[in-house]
């Protein structure tokens, strides 16, 4: 008996078409994506074949101007015109709190959502019960697959979950809901979620009982064969992962934002073994029409965003200093204020012990595009914004040794002077360089903002301790020349759209006045 | 659970036809086709034919002049039909799921006078 | 229609020994290859399907390997329970079986 698995992750906001790198759609002849066009695929496989399934794997949520605007309805209406099959919750459908999920999504979805390690208790749990499921048991066919959910038990730090949601470990949690489906004699089990690649492999191995593992979180890349776009495949698709007790058990994911399709097709004997496993993702590129119905919806939707992008956020009462010649050769303002706004972003009070989690942020100023004049009655719009942030990129939790937070520093100044955008912008760090220094040696003082303490003060860097940063998916992924950060990083999590993170800060505060004021010497 | 159980004649005399059933629990037929399979005593085991999922059905080409296989969807049931039985047919008859991952316990059916 | 070709066809060895039964197919069957055994009184299982996944309650003394054309079977530690006749069976087209291994007390 054969399956096809379509499978998402990771869409974040990607409801239009996008450019090749996930950006804002230029050239409509080049664009990828969108969920016109994903239906136009999905469809496509719908008719040519029996059974089956299109899951995601979370991560819907947060990512361009659509999240900001329409806060999770539109995932549900369009996920429902796709007919998604279930959904895996992910770290960032809880980016506008519990009731952000409930409302929007889980109360529109027609479609099951599933976490089988996320346990409600309190007065939540009576509110929320029966709108999430650990597992759900689909008809496919003159067959049933078990679908068990899972989320990064990470949420808590990389979103805003409450205090009334426990996120248990993945596979205590898995197991028995897994023995549960296998008391119900459902022998085809799919683990569906978003913890990671090495999560997803980890569950593939230890969880008896599953089948295949759709995943997300990760963004990873999986392909057999030569690539069809940029993206680099982190291994053969599907992944290939022995179970402790003797099963070869695929993984899969699909990479991110919509840009490609997962397709695989599994094989299954009559105990619901895998017997094969085969596929690839499928690029969604402008060989593939749009859908002319979903097109129209997208377009009728798209009205609001359009009145949205000119209305004032709250206003500077300071000139908002973005300029090429401040941020790439000093502390600017702009970049003080975006630093601010990512640690901002990021309060999570989930231990005593703590005042933050996370206290330091580093950007890179070329990556601030462009000031904003105080002297347009001081309004801030998102228009304003996305001239500053206009990659559509995200600001990502990642933890690095203070070795690697050293060298960045040292990086940053290592050519100063030729206007080059790898001069950093900071917050929760004070640095002070000699620039009359060799190259490498620049950094005479690099101070930090203390997490474990009630009282935030700086301390110096110690280079054997590992510290969390905010920083732009670009220097994540050794943007910049910033390989180091790339190639030591200990942990990263993606984040939330750059724009509106600064865009939340401005209307929280609603008058903003960000000074230089020593941060970088 | 998975089972396969074949039931039929113990004995079958020469030029008869045997008729055996193989009934299905646990998994359907609908999804799922059947092996049929014989090993003569002492002997090694040889492939006799199948049923697909779809009604469709495949034969051992030393076979195909005399045997047919059908089944009843609604009742779990697979039967196999071999016409012209020699002594040489004496076997055990196994029925076992399409991918072998379940078998039938086997019946030893005798053809003698 | 494909071929299989068992060997050894039969093998004496004692409890603790590591036992290796090889099958080479007439062409390349892509992995889908099976081995069961079969206990005296006649009873079919399947302990390995798809060339190295070990069928459920199957201990993890046996295990499977191969590609293209050449399959192996492999019990690491012989225990009494495990002297028996073994079996390869591709399923790539119709169904064949290899010879057989019975695998004796020394």
């Known amino acids: 008996w054969e399956l096809t698995i379509l499978h998402t992750n990771d869409v974040h906001s990607r409801l239009e078409q996008t450019s090749e790198d996930s950006s804002k759609c230029v050239n409509a002849s080049r664009c990828m994506g969108g969920v016109a066009r994903l239906f136009t695929k999905v469809q496509q496989i719908r008719r040519a074949e029996p059974n089956v399934l299109l899951l995601d794997a979370g991560d819907q949520y947060q990512g361009t101007i659509w999240f900001t605007v329409y806060k999770g309805a539109e995932v549900a209406h369009f996920m429902n015109a796709l007919r998604y099959d279930a959904m895996a919750l992910g770290n960032h459908e809880f980016d506008n709190g519990v009731e952000g999920l409930i409302e929007p999504l889980l109360k529109e979805a027609k479609f099951p959502i599933l976490s089988a390690n996320i346990k409600a208790k309190g007065p939540l749990a009576s509110q929320i019960s029966g709108l999430y499921l650990p597992y759900k048991v689909l008809p496919v066919g003159d067959e049933v697959v078990g679908i068990v959910g899972y989320t990064s038990k990470e949420t808590p730090f990389l979103s805003n979950p409450g205090t009334n949601l426990v996120f248990e470990d993945e596979i205590t949690a898995l197991q028995p809901e897994v023995d549960k489906l296998k008391t119900l004699n459902v022998n085809k089990i799919i683990a569906l979620g978003h913890s990671g690649f090495e999560m997803d492999k980890l569950i593939a191995q230890k969880v008896r009982g599953v089948d295949v593992v759709v995943g997300g979180h990760s963004n990873t890349f999986l392909y057999t064969g030569n690539p069809p776009s940029k993206e680099v495949p982190a291994g053969k698709y599907p992944f290939i992962v022995t179970s402790d007790d003797g099963r070869k058990v695929p993984v899969v994911q699909a990479y991110a934002f919509g840009k490609y399709l997962g397709y695989l097709k599994i094989e299954f004997d009559e105990r619901g073994n895998v017997i094969s496993s085969h596929g690839n993702p499928i690029l969604l590129n402008s060989s593939i029409p749009e859908d002319p119905s979903i097109k129209a919806d997208i377009n009728k939707w798209r009205i609001k965003l359009d009145n949205y992008s000119t209305q004032e956020l709250g206003k500077t009462i300071v000139y908002l200093d973005g300029s090429s010649q401040s941020c790439r050769f000093r502390e600017c303002n702009m970049g003080n204020l975006i630093c601010d706004a990512m640690i901002n972003n990021n309060l999570r009070h989930t231990d005593e012990m703590f005042w933050n989690h996370v206290s330091m942020c580093i950007l890179n100023g070329g990556g601030i595009r462009s000031p904003i004049d105080e002297r347009n009655n001081g309004t801030i719009t998102w228009e304003n914004l996305a001239a500053v942030l206009p990659f559509g990129g995200t600001f990502d939790l990642v933890q690095l040794k203070g070795s690697t937070l050293k060298k960045a520093f040292e990086h940053s100044v290592h050519r100063y002077g030729q206007s080059t955008g790898e001069f950093l912008q900071v917050g929760g760090i004070h640095v002070v360089y000699d620039l009359s220094r060799k190259p490498g040696d620049r950094v005479v003082k690099l101070d930090v903002l203390c997490t474990k303490c009630r009282v935030p003060s700086y301390d110096p860097l110690k280079m054997d301790e590992v510290y969390k940063v905010i920083l732009p998916n670009f220097l994540a992924n050794g943007g910049d020349g910033f390989q180091m950060i790339k190639d030591e990083l200990l942990r990263h999590d993606s984040g939330d759209q750059d724009i509106n993170v600064v865009s939340t800060y401005i209307s929280k505060m609603k008058v903003i006045y960000p000074a230089v004021e020593g941060r970088i010497k | 659970e998975v089972t396969l159980k074949e039931s039929g004649p113990v004995l079958v005399k020469p030029t008869e036809t045997l008729t055996l059933t193989c009934t299905v629990s646990?998994?359907?037929?609908?999804?799922?086709?059947i092996q049929w399979v014989r090993q003569p005593p002492g002997k090694l085991l040889e492939w006799l034919g199948v049923?697909?999922?779809?009604?469709?059905?495949d034969y051992n080409a030393a076979f195909i002049s005399r045997l047919t296989i059908s089944k009843d969807t609604s009742k779990s049931q697979v039967v196999l039909t071999m016409t012209n039985m020699d002594p040489v047919d004496t076997a055990t008859y196994y029925c076992?799921?399409?991918?072998?991952?379940?078998w039938g316990q086997g019946t030893l059916v005798t053809v003698s006078s | 229609d494909i071929q299989m070709t068992q060997s050894p066809s039969s093998l004496s060895a004692s409890v603790g020994d590591r036992v290796t039964i090889t099958c080479r197919a007439s062409?390349?069957?892509?992995?889908?290859l099976n081995w069961l055994q079969q206990k005296p009184g006649g009873a079919i299982k399947r302990l390995i399907y798809?060339?190295?996944s070990l069928d459920s309650g199957v201990p993890s003394r046996f295990s499977g390997s191969g590609s293209g054309s050449e399959y192996t079977l492999t019990i690491s530690s012989l225990q009494p329970e495990d002297f028996a006749d073994y079996y390869c069976?591709?399923?790539?087209?119709?169904?064949?079986f290899g010879g057989g291994t019975k695998v004796e007390i020394k």
């Open positions: 076992a799921g399409q991918y072998g991952s379940v």
């Open positions: 646990g998994f359907s037929l609908k999804s799922y086709g």
């Open positions: 049923i697909w999922s779809g009604g469709s059905a």
């Open positions: 062409q390349d069957i892509g992995d889908r």
């Open positions: 798809a060339t190295s």
């Open positions: 069976l591709q399923y790539a087209g119709s169904w064949t």
